[in-house]
């Protein structure tokens, strides 16, 4: 009786169940009753992810330079090229198929997490107590200087953008 | 016990034809491919051709293709090999064997084809 | 056609001793591999089939190994039984092939 189903990594074809070609593998032929599943190995530059049937191998994928992009990891027989942006940028989407540049955090704003190449930069408000008088992707918010640590005295007060100004203690005549 | 017997086998002219059958018995032929692989004296195995349990498919070395044809009755749990234009090169023992997931587990006990004028 | 070529054509051992019979095909075949004893005037009989799977009723003395374009068929402990000629067929794509025979004869 002929299978109406296979195995797992098998394929009906003919009434008959056939092996499929391993990752790293493209089929050349179909099975018989007399032969297994022909298979060869993609070419280079080309790769198969899966178990396949597939008579041709996918290309590797190219980081294209002038898009920011550049190769994270080398596409194998049995896997794609994983491409990343350059310093500076970051991927758009998880399979990051453009750059776009880091973000700036404004000032009054600190740098929560630095971007990576996947993912933008994480500003945060600078709590009380706390400052950044730049633009920057990677500063984070500073703490005031604490006056009191060098005998001085607060003379104009913090704010989310600037700092304290210290100044000397009034001396008592 | 599976059983494979082969016959019509003798001396033929080239040019000639001949036509071996393979009675089988013992198993469910239906569900079985077969094959047929000769030896020429003195010499070694050479796969000839195949034919799938439902006759579907068949398959022929390229040295025997257009000349040969495989077929089955399984009615009659019979294989045969229709030889035509014969040639002195096909001199050999032909032997039926029974497939079972790509290899050949029963073989018969061969008969003797002599291509010669 | 993949081509079949086995090592040594033939090989004169004695009972007991340690046989090794190689196979070698002209592409990659996987473990698609099989291998036969025939006795003169006797049909072949399966003794191994996908490279190292041992027939029912084929004695443990016999075991086979390989994958790819090299294979060996191992006889642990010759038999006098055991003196007969041994062919590879592969099956990795068609036509099936065999190779030309290893012919194992007393020493």
């Known amino acids: 009786e002929p299978p109406t189903a296979c195995r797992e990594k098998q394929y009906l074809i003919n009434s008959q169940c056939c092996s499929l070609c391993q990752p790293g593998q493209k089929l050349v032929s179909d099975c018989t009753e007399f032969t297994e599943t022909e298979c060869l190995p993609c070419d280079s530059g080309e790769f198969s992810a899966q178990w396949n049937r597939e008579i041709r191998c996918h290309q590797h994928r190219h980081c294209e330079p002038n898009q920011g992009l550049r190769v994270k990891k080398e596409g194998t027989a049995e896997s794609d090229t994983v491409c990343t942006c350059e310093e500076g940028w970051h991927c758009t989407s998880e399979a990051c198929e453009s750059c776009v540049l880091h973000r700036s955090c404004s000032p009054g704003f600190g740098v929560k997490q630095i971007a990576t190449g996947v993912s933008d930069t994480i500003c945060e408000p600078c709590p009380v107590g706390f400052f950044s008088n730049v633009s920057s992707a990677f500063e984070k918010c500073h703490p005031w200087t604490s006056c009191e640590t060098k005998d001085l005295v607060v003379q104009q007060a913090g704010t989310n953008k600037t700092d304290v100004v210290c100044g000397p203690q009034d001396r008592l005549r | 016990e599976v059983q494979l017997l082969e016959s019509g086998g003798g001396l033929v002219q080239p040019g000639g034809s001949l036509r071996l059958s393979c009675a089988a018995s013992?198993?469910?032929?239906?569900?079985?491919?077969m094959s047929w692989v000769r030896q020429a004296p003195g010499k070694g195995l050479e796969w000839v051709s195949g034919?799938?349990?439902?006759?579907?498919?068949?398959s022929y070395a390229d040295s025997v293709k257009g000349r040969f044809t495989i077929s089955r009755d399984n009615s009659k749990n019979t294989l045969y090999l229709q030889m035509n234009s014969l040639r002195a090169e096909d001199t050999a023992v032909y032997y039926c064997a029974r497939y079972y997931s790509y290899h050949m587990d029963y073989w018969g006990q061969g008969t003797l084809v002599t291509v010669s004028s | 056609d993949i081509q079949m070529t086995q090592s040594p054509s033939s090989l004169s051992a004695s009972v007991g001793d340690h046989v090794t019979i190689t196979c070698r095909a002209s592409q990659s075949i996987s473990s698609y591999l099989n291998w036969y004893q025939q006795k003169p005037g006797k049909a072949p009989k399966l003794l191994i089939y996908?490279?190292?799977s041992l027939q029912s009723g084929v004695p443990s003395r016999f075991s086979g190994s390989g994958s790819g374009t090299d294979f060996t068929l191992t006889i642990s402990s010759l038999q006098p039984e055991d003196f007969a000629t041994y062919y590879c067929?592969?099956?990795?794509?068609?036509?099936?092939?065999f190779g030309q025979g290893t012919k194992l004869e007393i020493k």
């Open positions: 013992g198993f469910t032929f239906s569900s079985y491919a």
């Open positions: 067929q592969q099956y990795g794509s068609a036509p099936p092939t």
């Open positions: 034919i799938g349990g439902s006759s579907s498919y068949t």
């Open positions: 996908a490279a190292s």
